[in-house]
Interface confidence: medium
């Protein structure tokens, strides 16, 4: 459909509240350092303008694209160069290059302090102005996560508001709020990581890679839907995510609403698990569909081999329409294997494709591809064995110990990577234990490998900004589906030149005593990484001794009457001790 005014069309479709929320998210994701009030001013101006276009679509500038309108707004900010440096250079470009330039300047690791919830202050803010409270939440999340899935952020903002509606009435606000906020925070961080992987797959590996990923995932979730039905949803979903990843948040949210409507209207041919979702309001409905439980498999499924090995027309079908035939293979294989990770399903599909490519050129293709399904077993065994070993290690060491084991493993593999990145990534990799190892056997594989894909994508995103390791670049760029096996296969880097010992790295102060437990752990794990960068060949025994001594040293000083004096005296002794142990 063509409209005289795109901005009027979106305003009418989305309604004022969602329109304002999405515009705020869009500006916050681009200008991550601007204060909230600046953004509110921009949103107000854009909203007023949109209303004039709704009233008269032929009014001046109403025919301009949303990219042009948004870009002009950004470029009109007087302090743009002062606060954002070369982002201002984008303003010299014409659309669509200008928008591409803005996207390239999004910062995945902005220097913004961690949000620390203060229940009393937050409840006061909430009760004073709910609308501002909602907007501030959108702003704070969006600026920290510039690729956050915008319509989903609107959903989380509703949940956030609901938490405060409930808890600010409670006698003990903190007891009510803090666990709920923490639970929501984990969900929001997972959502951010999932969307970042979707955007990376589209931007780095193309739309086809994203479509293959979605086809596998949706076939697992909706095994009763036929291939064309899944393909239809995949096509529409790819459009939605392309738009959101490209910063077209109004169009993205509008198309996502249309897709939810379509799915609900056709739920009879898609899944029996959507009934509850479809009775909900829009944002909750879309979220619910995205998180829907897996439907049961149809009872009458043929063995896969019938169509993809035993059928004498396999090569004919493959040659006639490669993408469609391979699509049906991935669909059929995925719907039968809800226990496999998406990455594993895509690796299997790649092996199947490579086998047909090879066999269909031979004299006797059926004899050649007869054993193709046997080739899949090693692909399945590799992650299963890895998960078994790592879950055993997790059970033995606990979460913190398991994280430390991963810090050692990954620092040895890629010691060139910055210490904060290694700590962040290894800590997140370590969470796979508590997330997945307690799950039933049939859920472990998909849980672990799909989660690891999110964490390794974070490593790839951070590393791309400042590349320091050829090994990381290779694992990140060669194949999306083989990233995890690529990192797992890395061995300790024997070419690495150890860092000089810098005493300052191991100097600690009284603030360590008052830090929350997780931040205390980060300090210790940072020291562990630095230690390994100095002594990459340190033995497990040496590292255990150093960590034990460190814990004792911190405990001693935090129990002393004068923390700072203790750290000043005991700190240098600890450094000498470390050097002695590692000598």
């Amino acid at each position: 459909d063509t409209y005289k005014s795109e901005i009027a069309h979106r305003f009418k479709d989305l309604g004022e509240q969602y329109f304002k929320g999405l515009v705020l998210i869009a500006f916050s994701q681009h200008l991550q350092q601007c204060p909230y009030e600046e953004h509110v001013k921009l949103v107000r101006e854009v909203t007023e303008f949109a209303k004039t276009c709704v009233a008269d679509e032929s009014a001046e500038n109403c025919d301009k694209s949303i990219h042009t309108l948004f870009g002009d707004k950004l470029c009109a900010i007087p302090s743009l160069r002062e606060h954002y440096g070369d982002l201002a250079d984008c303003c010299e470009k014409e659309e669509p290059e200008r928008n591409e330039c803005f996207l390239q300047h999004k910062n995945d690791n902005p220097d913004i302090p961690k949000l620390k919830p203060d229940p009393v202050a937050l409840c006061a803010d909430f009760q004073e102005d709910e609308q501002k409270f909602w907007g501030k939440y959108l702003y704070e999340i969006a600026r920290r996560h510039p690729y956050f899935y915008a319509p989903e952020l609107l959903y989380y903002a509703i949940i956030y508001k609901d938490v405060f509606s409930e808890c600010c009435q409670a006698a003990d606000k903190a007891a009510c709020l803090l666990p709920k906020i923490e639970h929501l925070r984990e969900k929001v961080l997972t959502s951010a990581a999932k969307q970042r992987l979707k955007c990376a797959s589209i931007q780095k590996f193309g739309e086809r890679a994203f479509k293959a990923w979605s086809l596998a995932r949706l076939s697992q979730r909706f095994p009763k839907a036929d291939f064309t039905e899944i393909s239809k949803i995949v096509t529409d979903l790819a459009k939605v995510h392309k738009e959101c990843c490209h910063g077209d948040l109004l169009e993205c949210a509008d198309d996502r609403a249309d897709l939810a409507k379509y799915i609900c209207e056709n739920q009879d041919t898609i899944s029996t698990k959507l009934k509850e979702c479809c009775d909900k309001p829009l944002l909750e409905k879309s979220h619910c569909i995205a998180e829907a439980k897996r439907d049961e498999l149809p009872a009458d499924l043929n063995p896969l081999e019938h169509d993809f090995v035993e059928d004498k027309e396999v090569c004919k079908n493959y040659k006639e329409a490669k993408h469609v035939f391979l699509g049906t293979f991935l669909y059929e294989y995925s719907r039968r294997h809800p226990d496999y990770s998406v990455s594993l399903l895509l690796r299997i599909a790649k092996i199947y494709e490579a086998t047909l490519e090879d066999c269909c050129a031979k004299e006797d293709p059926p004899a050649c591809y007869a054993t193709v399904f046997d080739k899949f077993q090693p692909l399945v065994d590799e992650p299963k064995n890895l998960i078994k070993q790592n879950c055993e290690l997790f059970e033995k060491l606990g979460e913190y110990g398991f994280q430390n084991a991963l810090i050692v493993r990954y620092t040895k593999k890629v010691p060139q990577v910055s210490t904060p990145t290694l700590v962040e990534v290894a800590r997140k990799l370590g969470l796979v234990g508590s997330r997945c190892c307690k799950r039933p056997e049939e859920e472990r594989l998909s849980c672990a490998e799909d989660y690891l894909s999110l964490v390794l994508n974070r490593l790839c995103v951070l590393h791309e900004k400042t590349p320091v390791s050829e090994k990381v670049t290779k694992c990140c760029t060669e194949s999306l589906v083989n990233r995890r096996p690529c990192f797992s296969a890395l061995t300790p880097d024997e070419t690495y030149k150890p860092k000089e010992f810098v005493e300052g790295t191991f100097t600690f102060h009284a603030d360590l005593c008052t830090l929350p437990e997780d931040e205390k752990q980060i300090k210790k794990q940072t020291a562990l990484v630095e230690l390994l960068k100095h002594k990459p060949h340190a033995t497990e025994e040496q590292l255990r001794t150093v960590l034990g001594n460190f814990a004792a040293f911190v405990q001693k000083c935090c129990a002393a009457p004068d923390h700072e004096a203790c750290f000043a005296v005991e700190g240098p002794k600890f450094v000498i001790e470390i050097r002695g142990i590692l000598a």
């Epitope: 036929d226 291939f227 064309t228 393909s231 239809k232 056709n266 149809p298 499924l301 043929n302 059929e332």
Partner: nanobody, 119 residues
Framework: EVQLLESGGGLVQPGGSLRLSCAAS????????MLWVRQAPGKGLEWVSV????????YYADSVKGRFTISRDNSKNTLYLQMNSLRAEDTAVYYC????????????WGQGTLVTVSS
């Protein structure tokens, strides 16, 4: 009972165009994906194109991509195949078929319409 009735075939010169139609009855057309298949003289059935119940997405065999366009009108229970830049190798009996619930095979098809491309 399911009925599919193809029409629009005929003799056409290379480079010419034809539009095939398929009138469907006996099932809920607007909830069924549909496809066109063809059979050249002395050859097996060849898959041509698939269309989802809503009209998108559509899929094409590599041999017809860019030349053929599948479409449908759910209000008329009719499936279409617009064939442009026709070649001698497109000569075949064209069948419309109802897409099945899973594999790239098909459940029901009509009696077919013959397309002959020759100078």
């Amino acid at each position: 009972e399911v009925q599919l009735l193809e029409s629009g075939g005929g003799l056409v010169q290379p480079g010419g165009s034809l539009r095939l139609s398929c009138a469907a009855s006996g099932f809920t057309f607007d909830t069924s994906s549909m496809l066109w298949v063809r059979q050249a003289p002395g050859k097996g059935l060849e898959w041509v194109s698939v269309i989802h119940q809503s009209g998108t997405p559509t899929y094409y065999a590599d041999s017809v991509k860019g030349r053929f366009t599948i479409s449908r009108d759910n209000s008329k229970n009719t499936l279409y195949l617009q064939m442009n830049s026709l070649r001698a190798e497109d000569t075949a009996v064209y069948y419309c078929a109802k897409f099945p619930s899973s594999r790239m095979k098909f459940d029901y098809w009509g009696q077919g319409t013959l397309v002959t491309v020759s100078s």
